[in-house]
């Protein structure tokens, strides 16, 4: 029998029952937070011998083996994982082993013991039979090994039954418990599994099997199960099913996920039945299984419960991530915040269409609209009193809407409405007329010209560059003289620059009024000279990279028919000159026969310009006369060469601190000082524990269901 | 707190027709899958038909496919059951139910686990 879809028993041990007929757990086996110590020898599943996502145990009081509840427990598939653990035990305060002696393969996905005080028998399992990668394994804090004294089958009678095999260059026997030895199969399966018999199954099988080469004798599938046979893929008008099993199409046309609250139902695509088109896929109409590539970004509809959604933090607008199309109305209220413009695109940037209204009010944080960089709609479903769709209030230190030679935006019904913006000139405002269609809607009074636009500079001369020099890491730039009509009001240059890998930057990017800014800026006072035209040497930079860089002259606040006057120039972009490449990474050597060797390597992380070819050279090395010191066919006398890891056992460390012998006359002396890589990375472990802990503590912990 | 209330229930020939109506409070129901299931006297509850809340994709039960048709009006908070060519077979007790949460994993559409909220039914009999 399938089980499933995920089995989470705890509180109450009798719960156990529910694995009763199991033959399959597709999903996860959690058994955690029984704190009643129970008898669990009446409680054996034998039946069970695949869990196809991940096993959890936490803080199970009375258990002391797992071996008697799951006997015939093979393979864990990991299709899913915890934290990236396929096996997870946690604080199990009385479990003396594991003991899932028929444990075979943990198909994807790494372990994590941590914090059981009495168990032990882990040093005497080699996980390299089980896992293919061990590095990832987190074996800490359970009860250390020398108060163990792990005995494996038959070794106190001197007639050791378990097979050996070298873990961290030491050699020894490999067993679950002290009557259960660890599985090896013959090197002659390679990687097949094979018989208690040791012989080998099937290909397609994974695990163990209960007949050899048969593919309908396999405990487990290495690759797919269908109608009683694994197969190396799902046959025609079969689909792939939680990375395991082929259903047919009536069984994913009628599923639903429990995970959601609606019906949306399961997908088929790329011969594999799923909870949801995979990214850059859409359903094909709404009764449709299958799925089509969106054209640029997915569609996402979000919907906001009060119609009104008011962003007035970077956590409010968090809520529209990947939103497309926004239903109902944005009210926008932005009055402070860190590295705002960049977050709200974050979150916000994907947004096409928004039904109803958008209201921009007291946003002072705001510098620029072009953080909702894809808005083409405004439907004006809905409209504020007044019939007004786009409402822009008080906005102190707003300086653009968009980049209009850049962007199309239509508001389909409404008004526009703009008061108290005293940095966004009226120009700008017009232009927004004619760009979204809504020229001739508003009244006299919906654009108020005398308190928009008063604090800035609106009528803008251009600044013209005269010339630009570069060099592989600098760049000389200079530009016309700017002469205002009163000389004395021109005080000073500021120049902007950045990197810009594409030639679409605007002046606003990443720019909001507590201090982002995305431009690097330098002032640049006047020459004194009247004749010698402003310029500026940027240094530091990167070579053959793209900068985009502008001038703006800074005035005094000049009124001349209501408006000040300003000069800046087109934004303009300039690479630096090519220069050497950083060294190729990764080289690696390896020779595939007697007068051959074969070299790999990567390219640089900075190439500084376009690579056209690599120098490659060699020169031979005297051969190292340690190998012929020793007689390589006495097999125990093959010296193990031991290399310095770069940590230190801290058990050892605090149990006898002078135990280092320095050499010559000086005797015993301490322990060498942590260097700050050691106490980095005991800092780092410290910090993912906790992270891995409160991510187990949020994940089981929940509100009892309704 | 989430009301269901089914109606449009009565008595019908064979081959007739009848609309049921199951009007939803205290939830947002745009949000929200649907379905129908019926319970005949002596039997067990089974599923009729079911409807996703963002798309509209629909799902009907052998024995009714090709003579129901669910369909839902979110701006009136209803979902509708429209029952053509009525059998016999069709009597019985039709309960609203909505979806919820529940857990991990997957359910078939006809699963009562996967639904939270439920009316009090409308009984439909079919009889000439």
């Known amino acids: 029998e399938i089980c499933g879809p995920g089995i989470d028993i705890r509180n109450d041990y009798q719960q156990l029952k529910r694995l009763e007929n199991c033959t399959v757990i597709e999903g996860y086996l959690h058994i955690l937070l029984i704190s009643k110590a129970e008898d669990y020898r009446s409680y054996r599943f034998p039946k069970l011998t695949v869990i196809t996502e991940y096993l959890l145990l936490f803080r199970v009081a009375g258990l002391e083996s797992l071996g008697d509840l799951f006997p015939n427990l093979t393979v864990i598939r990991g299709w899913k994982l915890f934290y990236n653990y396929a096996l997870v035990i946690f604080e199990m305060t009385n479990l003396k082993d594991i003991g899932l002696y028929n444990l075979r393969n943990i198909t994807r996905g790494a372990i994590r013991i941590e914090k059981n005080a009495d168990l032990c028998y882990l040093s005497t399992v080699d996980w390299s039979l089980i896992l293919d990668a061990v590095s990832n394994n987190y074996i800490v804090g359970n009860k250390p090994p020398k108060e163990c004294g792990d005995l494996c089958p038959g070794t106190m009678e001197e007639k050791p039954m378990c097979e050996k095999t070298t873990i961290n260059n030491e050699y020894n026997y490999r067993c679950w418990t002290t009557n259960r030895c660890q599985k090896m199969c013959p090197s002659t399966c390679g990687k097949r599994a094979c018989t208690e018999n040791n012989e080998c199954c099937h290909p397609e099988c994974l695990g163990s099997c209960s007949a050899p080469d048969n593919d309908t004798a396999c405990v487990a599938c290495r690759h797919y199960y269908y109608a009683g046979v694994c197969v190396p893929a799902c046959p025609p008008n079969t689909y792939r099913f939680e990375g395991w099993r082929c259903v047919d199409r009536d069984f994913c046309a009628n599923i639903l996920s429990a995970e959601s609250s609606d019906s949306e139902g399961f997908v088929i695509h790329d011969g594999e039945c799923m909870q949801e088109c995979p990214s850059g896929f859409i359903r094909n109409g709404s009764q449709s299984m299958y799925c089509i590539p969106c054209e640029g970004p997915c569609p996402k509809v979000c919907e906001e419960e009060k119609k009104t959604k008011t962003i007035d933090s970077v956590t409010s607008a968090q809520m529209l991530q990947g939103c497309t199309i926004f239903k109902g109305n944005l009210l926008i209220n932005i009055r402070r915040g860190n590295n705002i413009a960049s977050e709200l695109e974050n979150f916000m940037g994907l947004i096409e269409v928004v039904t109803g209204y958008v209201k921009i009010r007291h946003s002072h944080a705001l510098v620029s609209l072009s953080f909702l960089k894809n808005l083409r709609l405004i439907l004006g479903e809905e409209q504020l009193e007044g019939n007004y769709s786009f409402y822009v209030l008080d906005n102190q230190n707003l300086q653009q809407l968009w980049d209009w030679d850049h962007r199309n935006l239509t508001i389909k019904a409404g008004k526009m409405y703009f008061a108290f913006n005293p940095k966004l000139c009226v120009s700008e405002i017009y232009r927004m007329e004619e760009v979204t269609g809504t020229k001739g809607r508003q009244s006299k009074g919906d654009i108020n010209t005398r308190n928009n636009g008063e604090r800035a500079s609106c009528e803008s001369d251009v600044l013209h560059f005269t010339s630009t020099t570069t060099s592989k890491n600098r760049i000389i730039i200079t530009w016309h003289r700017y002469r205002p009509p009163d000389y004395r009001d021109l005080i000073s240059f500021t120049v902007y620059y950045k990197e810009a890998p594409f030639k679409n930057v605007t002046e606003y990017d990443g720019q909001d009024a507590c201090g982002s800014n995305s431009w690097n800026m330098v002032d640049v006072d006047l020459p004194p000279n009247k004749d010698v035209e402003p310029g500026i040497l940027l240094h530091g930079l990167k070579p053959w990279t793209q900068y985009a860089v502008y001038v703006k002259a800074v005035t005094l606040t000049m009124v001349e028919n209501d408006h000040i006057r300003g000069a800046k120039s087109e934004i303009l972009y300039i690479r630096t000159n090519a220069s050497v490449p950083s060294i190729p990474l990764d080289v690696l050597s390896a020779s595939n026969s007697s007068s051959q060797l074969i070299v790999k390597w990567n390219p640089p992380s900075l190439p500084n310009g376009n690579l056209s070819y690599y120098i490659v050279r060699w020169q031979r090395q005297p051969q190292d006369g340690y190998l012929y010191r020793h007689n390589y066919c006495s097999k125990d006398k093959i010296p193990i060469r031991k290399y310095a890891d770069g940590t230190i056992d801290i058990e050892e460390v605090t149990e006898n601190p002078k135990t280092e012998v320095c050499g010559g006359e000086k005797g015993p002396c301490c322990a060498c000082p942590k260097t700050e890589a050691e106490k980095q990375a005991e800092k780092e472990e410290a910090e993912y524990r906790k992270v891995f802990e409160n991510f187990l503590h949020n994940s089981i912990f929940v509100p009892r269901p309704e | 707190e989430v009301q269901l209330v089914e109606s449009g229930g009565g008595l019908v020939q064979p081959g007739g027709s009848l609309r049921l109506s199951c009007t939803a409070s205290?939830?947002?129901?745009?949000?929200?899958?649907m379905a129908w299931f019926r319970q005949a006297p002596g039997k067990e509850r089974e599923g009729v038909s079911a409807?996703?809340?963002?798309?509209?994709?629909?799902y009907y039960a052998d024995s009714v496919k090709g003579r129901f048709t669910i369909s839902r009006d979110n701006s009136k908070n209803t979902l509708y059951l429209q029952m053509d060519a009525l059998r016999a077979e069709d009597t019985a007790v039709y309960y609203c139910?909505?979806?919820?949460?529940?857990?991990?994993?997957?359910?078939?559409?006809?699963?009562?686990?996967?639904?939270?909220?439920w009316g009090q039914g409308t009984l439909v009999t079919v009889s000439s």
């Open positions: 205290g939830l947002t129901f745009g949000t929200f899958g």
């Open positions: 139910a909505v979806r919820s949460k529940n857990g991990a994993g997957y359910g078939f559409w006809y699963e009562a686990r996967l639904y939270g909220y």
């Open positions: 409807i996703s809340a963002s798309s509209g994709r629909t």
